[in-house]
Interface confidence: medium
C-alpha cells in the first residue's frame, strides 16, 4: 500500500531512510541532458522473499543530445500523489540487504542519474530527520516519521524536531513543551514495524560498543 502523502516537511531539516520497505519504488530519473534509454524501466522496485530483498529493474540513462528537447521523467499518474524527493548523498550507503529483513538498502548510483531521487514509499516506511548544516536541533527527537495506516487512510507521524539557526535564541518565546509529550520509546508507537522490531531486538540482545585508540601520534 503506497503512502498517500509525503513525509512531513521540517524547516531546515532533511530526511533519509535507513532502508526501504519492499514495495518502495524509485523513479529512474536522469540528469539534465540525459534521458531514460528506450524501453528502459520507469522505476526500480524493492522486492523480495522472506530471506532476501533487492531492487528489481535497472535504471539507465543515455545522452539526449540528439533530441531537440530534454525529456524530463515524471511519475505515472497513479504515482503522482506520492512523489518524494530526497537529495543524493555521496558516497552512497553500502548495498547490504542482509541486515533488515523485508527491506532494501540505498540502491547504488547509476550513470548520469539526476541529483535528486524520487521515492514512492509504502506503509510502514520509517524516515529519519536531521537539521541541515548551520542549524541545530531543538527538541532533539525522536526525529523520525513513520507512514501508518489508520482507518483505511495513510498518514505520517510527526517528528519531534525543530531546527534553529545558531544565531537564533535557544528558546522560542512561550515555547515550553515539545510538539508531543515524551511518553515512551518509538517501539510503543510503531511496534508493528520491522525496523522498530529490530531496535527492540537490539536492546534485548544487550548491544555492545567497544572503544579503542585507532591512531595516536605523539610529537
Amino acid at each position: 500500500e503506497l503512502c498517500d502523502d509525503d513525509p512531513p516537511e521540517i524547516p531546515h531539516a532533511t530526511f533519509k531512510a535507513m532502508a526501504y520497505k519492499e514495495g518502495t519504488m524509485l523513479n529512474c530519473e536522469c540528469k539534465r541532458g540525459f534521458r531514460r534509454i528506450k524501453s528502459g524501466s520507469l522505476y526500480m522496485l524493492c522486492t523480495g522473499n522472506s530471506s532476501h530483498s533487492s531492487w528489481d529493474n535497472q535504471c539507465q540513462c543515455t545522452s539526449s543530445a540528439t533530441r531537440n528537447t530534454t525529456k524530463q521523467v515524471t511519475p505515472q499518474p497513479e504515482e503522482q500523489k506520492e512523489r518524494k524527493t530526497t537529495e543524493m548523498q555521496s558516497p552512497m550507503q553500502p548495498v547490504d540487504q542482509a541486515s533488515l529483513p523485508g527491506h532494501c538498502r540505498e540502491p547504488p548510483p547509476w550513470e548520469n542519474e539526476a541529483t535528486e531521487r524520487i521515492y514512492h514509499f509504502v506503509v510502514g516506511q520509517m524516515v529519519y530527520y536531521q537539521c541541515v548544516q548551520g542549524y541545530r536541533a531543538l527538541h532533539r527527537g525522536p526525529a523520525e516519521s513513520v507512514c501508518k495506516m489508520t482507518h483505511g487512510k495513510t498518514r505520517w507521524t510527526q517528528p519531534q524536531l525543530i531546527c534553529t539557526g545558531e544565531m537564533e535564541t535557544s528558546q522560542f518565546p512561550g515555547e515550553e513543551k515539545p510538539q508531543a509529550s515524551p511518553e515512551g520509546r518509538p517501539e510503543s508507537e510503531t511496534s508493528c514495524l520491522v525496523t522498530t522490531t529490530d531496535f527492540q531486538i537490539q536492546t534485548e540482545m544487550a548491544a555492545t560498543m567497544e572503544t579503542s585508540i585507532f591512531t595516536t601520534e605523539y610529537q
Epitope: L138, P182, T195, F199, Q202
Partner: antibody
C-alpha cells in the same frame, strides 16, 4: 601536546545506522562532557562549540564503527573518552563503550 | 547552552535509606531529562529516560519525576550496589549537557 588522537568505537548486536552515536569525555575526577555526535545514515556530525574545529567525528556503516579524532592535543585533553548510543537524540544514551583513556603528556 | 545544576553536591546515606537527588535546568526542558549512574572506573549507565521512564533492567527502587526545570531522582531503599555518582542530562537541545554529578557515599 600538539598531536592528534583517533579513537574508534565498534558497535555490535544490531542496527547501527539509525542511532545517534555520541562521544562523551570525562577528565580525571570530573564530570561528563558531550563532545559531539553523528547519525551514521546522514554522515554529518554535530559538535559542541568548545570542540568545534578540533574534533572530527565520522562513521563507517559497513563496519558499524564510529571514529572521533581530536587534534592539537593539550594536557587538559587527558581524559577517558566514551562513545554512547542514543535512540535518536532523546531517549538517553543507553549503550556505552567501555571507554578509552587518552593521556597527553610531554 | 542549557546549564544543569544538581543538589546536593554530595551526600552520605545508609543502606535502606530513601535518597533524593534534584536537578535544575537553566531553562524549561519539558521532560527531556535522563539520569545516569556511574561507578568508579566504569562507563555511565542509563537509569531513567524522559524524566520518569525506567530503563529496561533497572531496579524499580529507582524513580524519576519532574518536568520543566525541576527534576528528582529517588532511590526508595538504598542498596549497597547503589553507592555511586549520579548525573542528570538534558536532551532537549544541542548540545546535551550534564549536571556535575553528586556522589552518594556510605555514611
Amino acid at each position: 601536546p600538539g598531536s592528534s588522537v583517533k579513537v574508534s568505537c565498534k558497535a555490535s548486536g544490531g542496527t547501527f545506522s539509525s542511532y545517534a552515536i555520541s562521544w562523551v569525555r570525562q577528565a580525571p575526577g570530573q564530570g561528563l562532557e558531550w563532545m559531539g555526535g553523528i547519525i551514521p545514515i546522514f554522515g554529518t556530525a554535530n559538535y559542541a562549540q568548545k570542540f568545534q574545529g578540533r574534533v572530527t567525528i565520522t562513521a563507517d556503516e559497513s563496519t558499524s564503527t564510529a571514529y572521533m579524532e581530536l587534534s592539537s592535543l593539550r594536557s587538559e585533553d587527558t581524559a577517558v573518552y566514551y562513545c554512547a548510543r542514543e535512540m535518536y537524540y532523546y531517549y538517553g544514551m543507553d549503550v556505552w563503550g567501555q571507554g578509552t583513556t587518552v593521556t597527553v603528556s610531554s | 547552552d542549557i546549564q544543569m545544576t544538581q543538589s546536593p553536591s554530595s551526600l552520605s546515606a545508609s543502606v535502606g535509606d530513601r535518597v533524593t537527588i534534584t536537578c535544575r535546568a537553566s531553562q524549561s526542558i519539558s521532560s527531556y531529562l535522563n539520569w545516569y549512574q556511574q561507578k568508579p572506573g566504569k562507563a555511565p549507565k542509563l537509569l531513567i529516560y524522559a524524566a520518569s521512564s525506567l530503563q529496561s533492567g533497572v531496579p524499580s527502587r529507582f524513580s524519576g519525576s519532574g518536568s520543566g526545570t525541576d527534576f528528582t531522582l529517588t532511590i526508595s531503599s538504598l542498596q549497597p550496589e547503589d553507592f555511586a555518582t549520579y548525573y542528570c542530562q538534558q536532551s532537549y537541545s544541542t548540545p546535551p549537557t550534564f549536571g556535575q554529578g553528586p556522589k552518594v557515599e556510605i555514611k
